[in-house]
């Protein structure tokens, strides 16, 4: 029986050109995390494997950094980064848990009066 729950950073609004951290946390289970996949729509962004470490998809290498922890840092944000991101936890013996985070990237003029975030 899958007892775990995924907590996420929550949905985020961010400024074009800025950076944000996407994070998920698996709790309420003793299952072992074997791998975490980060995806957007049907695209694989990155994998963190318990044995092999991080692999960033070649097409995202310039703008995606691993961590902190099992999270993912997205840099040099563009409007086209707006969308839903998935953290997919592969665990044993429970199976797969999925968290969802929506990111809206705003033009600077909009972000000034919106809820915008940028990591220095």
């Amino acid at each position: 029986m899958m007892t775990g729950t995924i907590e996420t950073t929550g949905n985020i609004s961010a400024e074009k050109g800025g950076s944000i951290i996407l994070q998920c946390h698996l709790s309420s289970t003793t299952a072992q995390v074997t791998q975490v996949n980060w995806e957007q729509q049907d695209q694989l962004l990155a994998i963190c494997n318990a044995d092999l470490g991080w692999h960033i998809s070649p097409s995202f290498k310039d703008r995606v950094a691993p961590g902190p922890g099992l999270g993912l840092t997205l840099q040099s944000l563009t409007v086209n980064d707006t969308g839903e991101y998935f953290c997919i936890y592969h665990t044993y013996p429970d199976g797969t848990y999925t968290g969802r985070i929506f990111l809206e990237v705003l033009e600077s003029s909009v972000a000034e009066h919106g809820a915008r975030f940028q990591i220095p």
Epitope: G10, N11, I20, I21, G83, E84, R100, E104, L106
Partner: antibody
Framework: EVHLQQSGPELVKPGASMKISCKAS????????MNWVKQSHGKNLEWIGL????????SYNQKFKGKATLTVDKSSSTAYMEFLSLTSEDSAVYYC????????????WGQGTSVTVSS | DVVVTQTPLSLPVSFGDQVSISCRSS???????????LSWYLHKPGQSPQLLIY???NRFSGVPDRFSGSGSGTDFTLKISTVKPEDLGMYYC?????????FGGGTKLEIK
């Protein structure tokens, strides 16, 4: 002035599918997320999902995944929601609603489309 | 999914009353950057829902200042300082912090 004009009421048979349209005017269509909301029995509101006109990306409430398909036609500034394999549970009023940038809220709503599923 | 609970279900009022509607969520609506995506809507019979408050306490364009929003974490309140006839209808809160977005069950503001 922002305006969202939805298609007219639908009477459809169980098992059929239908497509509702939402034509946007008064703003730049690709700059704002479009949401879809279901209102059943004149009370409960449920978020069906959203579409990003700029890149076609979608996000669905899992309850409606496989039931609803969201698309846009940028050339006509129109958002569409297709509903598949309709049952009596799908009888409701459906709204499109523009996303308020930066705040995950809905600032302008269409007039609603009433859908009745009946044989 | 985040469960959003509104109270009361029904709120009988007299014009001129001050009223409060409560909205509670099953988990915190503050994201990791400190923003909280909680909004309030009024749905009048025969009309579309209209946005009143976004981001907990920001009044939307054209919304009278008798409407105010407050709260944090899991506990939020909409206040109407002096109820007017045009305020009658169903009030809903919506959380947009977590996927999927979820509405409260609604509060019916009606005349006593």
């Amino acid at each position: 002035e922002v305006h969202l004009q939805q298609s007219g009421p639908e009477l459809v048979k169980p098992g059929a599918s239908m497509k509702i349209s939402c034509k946007a005017s008064g703003y730049s269509f690709t700059d704002y997320i479009m949401n879809w909301v279901k209102q059943s029995h004149g009370k409960n509101l449920e978020w069906i999902g959203l579409i990003i006109p700029y890149n076609g990306g979608t996000s669905y409430n899992q309850k409606f995944k496989g039931k609803a398909t969201l698309t846009v036609d940028k050339s006509s500034s129109t958002a569409y929601m297709e509903f598949l394999s309709l049952t009596s549970e799908d009888s409701a009023v459906y709204y499109c609603a523009r996303g308020l940038r930066g705040y995950y809220a809905m600032d302008y709503w269409g007039q609603g489309t009433s859908v009745t599923v009946s044989s | 999914d985040v469960v959003v609970t509104q109270t009361p279900l029904s709120l009988p009022v007299s014009f001129g009353d001050q009223v409060s509607i409560s909205c509670r969520s099953s988990q915190s609506l503050a994201n990791s950057y400190g923003s909280t995506f909680l909004s309030w809507y009024l749905h009048k019979p025969g009309q579309s829902p209209q946005l009143l408050i976004y981001g907990i306490s920001n009044r939307f364009s054209g919304v009278p200042d008798r409407f105010s929003g407050s709260g944090s974490g899991t506990d939020f309140t909409l206040k109407i300082s002096t109820v007017k006839p045009e305020d009658l209808g169903m009030y809903y809160c919506l959380q947009g912090t977590h996927q999927p977005w979820t509405f409260g069950g609604g509060t019916k503001l009606e005349i006593k």
